[in-house]
Interface confidence: low
């Protein structure tokens, strides 16, 4: 079998809300993946599991099941959203993210994603990690592949 390629494109949008009482930030982060099937037979994308880390702490997880079928030599773009919560021991970030005196409130998040594909009863997992800037101070939509990132793409340990 030929390879199935997973390419993390970046953050498509980040929608932010706050709970001032508990100094908590809620970030709904929508990411975009390109999945390319280089085989001459179709492949099922069984699930996508994703998690987001801030400062080595997992702040959000998501799982999509029974996503799509990718035809032979075809590519599909898939968006997935990870709801994240920055709270508790990281609530000091509330002050940074709500500070009115600065325009861009970028924080560095690590996006981790694992795509599970299946064909002929065989299952394959492909994982990627990417450090990404996200603005926690306002709702932001990004041009695909235009969102700022730190180029530290590496396979999941």
């Amino acid at each position: 079998p030929r390879s199935i390629e997973v390419k993390y494109i970046g953050v498509k949008s980040a929608y932010v809300s706050y709970d001032a009482e508990k100094r908590t930030i809620y970030l709904n982060i929508t990411n975009t993946l390109n999945i390319t099937n280089n085989n001459y037979y179709s492949v099922e994308v069984e699930n996508i599991t994703a998690q987001v880390q801030f400062s080595k702490t997992v702040i959000g997880k998501a799982r999509l099941n029974n996503i799509t079928n990718i035809g032979p030599l075809d590519m599909k773009q898939i968006d997935y959203t990870v709801p994240t919560v920055i709270a508790e021991e990281m609530s000091y970030m509330y002050d940074f993210c709500t500070l009115l005196s600065i325009k861009v409130h970028n924080i560095v998040l690590m996006m981790q994603v694992t795509v599970t594909t299946a064909y002929f009863g065989h299952s394959e997992q492909i994982s990627q990690e990417r450090y990404q800037y996200v603005d926690c101070g306002r709702n932001t939509t990004y041009q695909l592949a235009q969102s700022e990132y730190l180029n530290v793409l590496q396979p999941q340990q």
Epitope: A20, K22, R23, E89, L100
Partner: antibody
Framework: QVQLQQSGPELVKPGASVKISCKAS????????IHWVKQRPGQGLEWIGW????????NYNEKFKGKATLTADTSSSTAYMQLSSLTSEDSAVYYC??????????????WGTGTTVTVSS | DVLMTQTPLSLPVSLGDHASISCRSG???????????LEWYLQKPGQSPKLLIY???NRFSGVPDRFSGSGSGTDFTLKISRVEAEDLGIYYC?????????FGGGTKLEIK
């Protein structure tokens, strides 16, 4: 040590306004919420609202919107609550409070001394 | 508003006795961030309230270990294992999960 010192008792006439103060000491005033709590004689406690002195943002219990106005003066590390259009229902002890020690865990672990407001003609 | 109902209103005890105060919320007070902000305060006559327990079961600094909190969802309990004279006063539960934050009506712990 961390303290919230409130202004003295007030005797005011119905329909008038009163402004009571809460002076913070022993910590960085701009970094912690100041809450206000009402206690009528022989009754329980009611949360009025909070102010975050660092940016002046406030949040009120709907019940006290229009009745209470919260402000803060960072230069003197003092929070204020103004009560308007006073009636006998507003006669109470008013406390300021702050979540200094447990900022991420609890609401009121430092309390002011309380200010008694009596509304009487 | 979330109604916090405390029982009993009055709790007569002898020194050294065990005491238990119940607090029931009108709806679940699990905050959207997963925590339950249920607190217990003690107010002695002529004094400001003092924090005893936060997030259901955590004793605040300096609070004796004879005080313990438990519960989940809508039902919460404060227990005092051996009542001492300094424990007398009015106990309030409080929820900080849903605005407006609300207190229970209070339970007066007094000598039998």
């Amino acid at each position: 040590q961390v303290q919230l010192q409130q202004s003295g008792p007030e005797l005011v006439k119905p329909g008038a306004s009163v402004k009571i103060s809460c002076k913070a000491s022993g910590y960085r005033f701009t970094s912690y919420y100041i809450h206000w709590v009402k206690q009528r004689p022989g009754q329980g406690l009611e949360w009025i609202g909070w102010i975050y002195p660092g940016n002046g943002i406030t949040n009120y219990n709907e019940k006290f919107k229009g009745k209470a106005t919260l402000t803060a003066d960072t230069s003197s590390s003092t929070a204020y609550m103004q009560l308007s259009s006073l009636t006998s229902e507003d006669s109470a002890v008013y406390y300021c409070a702050s979540p200094y020690y447990g900022i991420r865990n609890c609401y009121f672990d430092v309390w002011g001394t309380g200010t008694t407001v009596t509304v009487s003609s | 508003d979330v109604l916090m109902t405390q029982t009993p209103l009055s709790l007569p005890v002898s020194l050294g006795d065990h005491a238990s105060i119940s607090c029931r919320s009108g709806q679940s007070i699990v905050h959207s961030n997963g925590n339950t902000y249920l607190e217990w305060y003690l107010q002695k006559p002529g004094q400001s309230p003092k924090l005893l327990i936060y997030k259901v079961s955590n004793r605040f600094s300096g609070v004796p270990d004879r005080f313990s909190g438990s519960g989940s969802g809508t039902d919460f309990t404060l227990k005092i294992s051996r009542v001492e004279a300094e424990d007398l006063g009015i106990y309030y539960c409080f929820q900080g999960s849903h605005v407006p934050w609300t207190f229970g009506g209070g339970t007066k712990l007094e000598i039998k």
